[in-house]
């Protein structure tokens, strides 16, 4: 073990002792005491039986990730010392690891690190403070009480920009005017739009399209195509009546009822 | 500049207890964390353990398991070290060390360290 032409001496694993918070990413540091020319490095779990599992390697600088992709080596810039991290490391992650690295022909040898050990703990909502910290339980509540509050807050806000969008959009329609992409940004539909609850009314079966044309409101070209669908305040004509096996979900209000906003 | 002032330290029985500290100043705190290390005489200066700023994760070195503990308090910018069970081969100069990046296990790859603590631990 002491010839003098051995590549290198044997190698450190550090910490030996490491303590993580679940949810964080766990690093240990396997260091070489020089650089051999070819080597292949091997990060280990030791099992319950004794046994090395191989988590991940590096070989002629390239990383050869394991089955699971948490576990990552990293070669730092002095080229001895290796990063051996767990990204997101979790309560049963806790346990014994190392490193080994073969040194390969001609003086093929393999030397092995010292053994480490790694603790897990359970994520605490705050740093320890002079005060006890509450059961997590009770925080647990907390974190629900704290998202219903906000969902509620949300949806009535959300509600309140519905109610604007449709009273802005609306008396315009009823006069004629073109639903134009400009203004009324918030009701395009799309992966940037910001959400907004959406009422599908189908497909509109309008009979009377075909005998009376009506010339559309003159409107500046867009790339979304928008339908407005005026009720005009006048009684109601059968060539004029949506087929009532078209509407899906709530009805509009009827041509009888003069012009309105849709019911919230 | 960073500055890294010890406290702390002292003579001990073997057996007993001892907590030394390391206040920082001038830094922001978007570095790694802080750390121990110690030199006995005719030793050379090795790592003891070390704390990342969220404080979820610490190191120690062997020596230290069981019987070290590393804390810190941001709102005071101070890392301490408890020392328990102490050993008279405990018996070395402490010094504080920070880390810019990620942990380093070897002395000559820490940028700043504290002035030293004397911890002497009688048989």
């Known amino acids: 073990l002491d010839s003098p032409d051995r590549p290198w001496s044997p190698l450190t694993f550090s910490p030996a002792q490491l303590t993580v918070q679940e949810g964080e990413n766990a690093t240990f540091t396997c260091s070489l005491a020089d650089i051999p020319d070819s080597f292949v490095l091997n990060w280990y779990r030791l099992s319950p039986r004794n046994q090395t599992d191989k988590l991940a390697a590096f070989q002629e600088d390239r990383i050869e990730p394991g089955r699971d992709r948490r576990f990552r080596v990293t070669r730092l810039p002095n080229g001895r010392d290796f990063h051996m991290s767990i990204v997101a490391a979790r309560l049963n992650d806790s346990g014994i690891y190392l490193c080994g690295a073969i040194y390969l022909p001609p003086n093929t040898q393999i030397n092995e690190s010292p053994r480490a050990e790694l603790s897990v703990t359970e994520r605490t909502l705050e740093p320890p403070t002079q005060s006890p910290s509450p059961p997590p339980r009770l925080s647990g509540q907390l974190q629900g009480l704290v998202i219903g509050v906000t969902s509620v807050l949300v949806g009535v806000l959300l509600l309140l920009l519905l109610t604007w969008v449709l009273a802005a959009v609306f008396p315009r329609a009823t006069r004629g005017a073109c639903v134009c992409g400009s203004e009324d940004e918030p009701l395009k539909e799309g992966p940037d739009a910001a959400p907004v609850f959406t009422l599908d009314y189908g497909e509109l079966d309008f009979q009377w399209r075909e005998k009376t044309p009506e010339p559309p409101a003159p409107c500046a070209p867009e790339q979304t195509e928008y339908a407005t669908i005026v009720f005009p305040g006048r009684p109601a004509s059968p060539g004029r009546r949506a087929s009532a096996s078209s509407l899906q979900g709530a009805q509009p209000p009827s041509p009888e009822d003069g012009p309105g906003l849709w019911p919230l | 500049q960073v500055q890294l002032q010890q406290s702390g330290g002292g003579l001990v029985q073997a057996g007993g207890s001892l907590r030394v500290s390391c206040a920082a100043s001038?830094?922001?705190?978007?570095?790694?964390?802080m750390g121990w290390f110690r030199q006995a005489p005719g030793k050379e200066r090795e790592f003891v353990a070390a704390?990342?700023?969220?404080?979820?994760?610490?190191y120690y070195a062997d020596s230290a398991k069981g019987r070290f503990t590393i804390s810190r308090d941001n709102a005071k910018n101070t890392v301490y070290l408890q020392m328990n069970s102490l050993k008279p081969e405990d018996t070395a100069v402490y010094y504080c060390?920070?880390?810019?990046?990620?942990?380093?296990?070897?002395?000559?790859?820490?940028?700043?360290w504290g002035q030293g603590t004397q911890v002497t631990v009688k048989p």
């Open positions: 704390i990342s700023w969220s404080g979820g994760t610490q």
């Open positions: 060390a920070d880390y810019t990046d990620y942990v380093v296990y070897r002395p000559q790859e820490i940028g700043y």
């Open positions: 001038g830094r922001t705190f978007s570095s790694y964390g």
